[in-house]
Amino acid sequence: GPVPPSTALRELIEELVNITQNQKAPLCNGSMVWSINLTAGMYCAALESLINVSGCSAIEKTQRMLSGFCPHKVSAGQFSSLHVRDTKIEVAHFITKLLSYTKQLFRHGQQFN
């Protein structure tokens, strides 16, 4: 039968956990990204924010995973899902927030928002 929709989300959560736990030096050299509203279109917005960080191998798998949750192609400098761009935060903080919210979605049996 159909696969429970939570399985792919669990893979994303595991990768985010891996990043937060293995963080030794400042993640992505302390790069700053746009904060996002963790509401509708979160995955596309998260990707649009993170895609602007280049040369950071630690988050490349996360960027790639997020593309599987976003229906359209995302390129650097694209902000169609980032409705509000007024606050920048460190990538490490961004990943922590994203992890916290995806865990909530997972607990409530949601996958796509």
């Epitope: 696969v3 929709p5 593309s67 949750f69």
Partner: antibody
Amino acid sequence: EVQLLESGGGLVQPGGSLRLSCAASGFTFSSYAMSWVRQAPGKGLEWVSAFSGSGGSTYYADSVKGRFTISRDNSKNTLYLQMNSLRAEDTAVYYCVQDGLGPYFYNYGMDVWGQGTTVTVSS
Amino acid sequence: SYELTQPPSVSVSPGQTASITCSGDKLGDKYTCWFQQKPGQSPVLVIYHDSKRPSGIPERFSGSNSGDTATLTISGTQAMDEADYYCQAWDSSTYVFGTGTKVTVLG
């Protein structure tokens, strides 16, 4: 280490049937979409079919629609391709491929390929 | 149906740059992947998301994609890069592979 091992290929007469299997290991099989891609002798790559990891959607190339059926057994970490009404032009090496995550798995990139199993359709 | 067109062959001298193009209608709006296939072997993903390299793929492989054309560039080409290369994209619920390009390293 991610591994994909195809089996079930062989010689079959036109109009016949064959079922290919792909045993997967080294990753959470149920989370990932999986595809079959084939390559006729001396020709290029041709995508055959895909089975998404989330929601269980299936996709087919026009050339096999109505004749081939993709399925998966997540408890056995195995992908299948049931091929009916086989034609000479179906002769090819068939590759099992680990595809992407999520509902838009096709955005991810086909990461891991098996070694392939050869299907020959001839009388 | 959607089509991706590649040149049948590209020749390059060792140490030089090889460029392979892949043309398709509004291809720049889609993610493009590139695969390398050596004789008797399974294909290997060398570029995903237009320009990203999977781990283990040498830095000499790079990609770009805009308008109707995606390009795979091999800088400082080595003998081991001699292979067939295929682009790939997703359109209307199907994967589409390019026609394939044979890269020959001269000498």
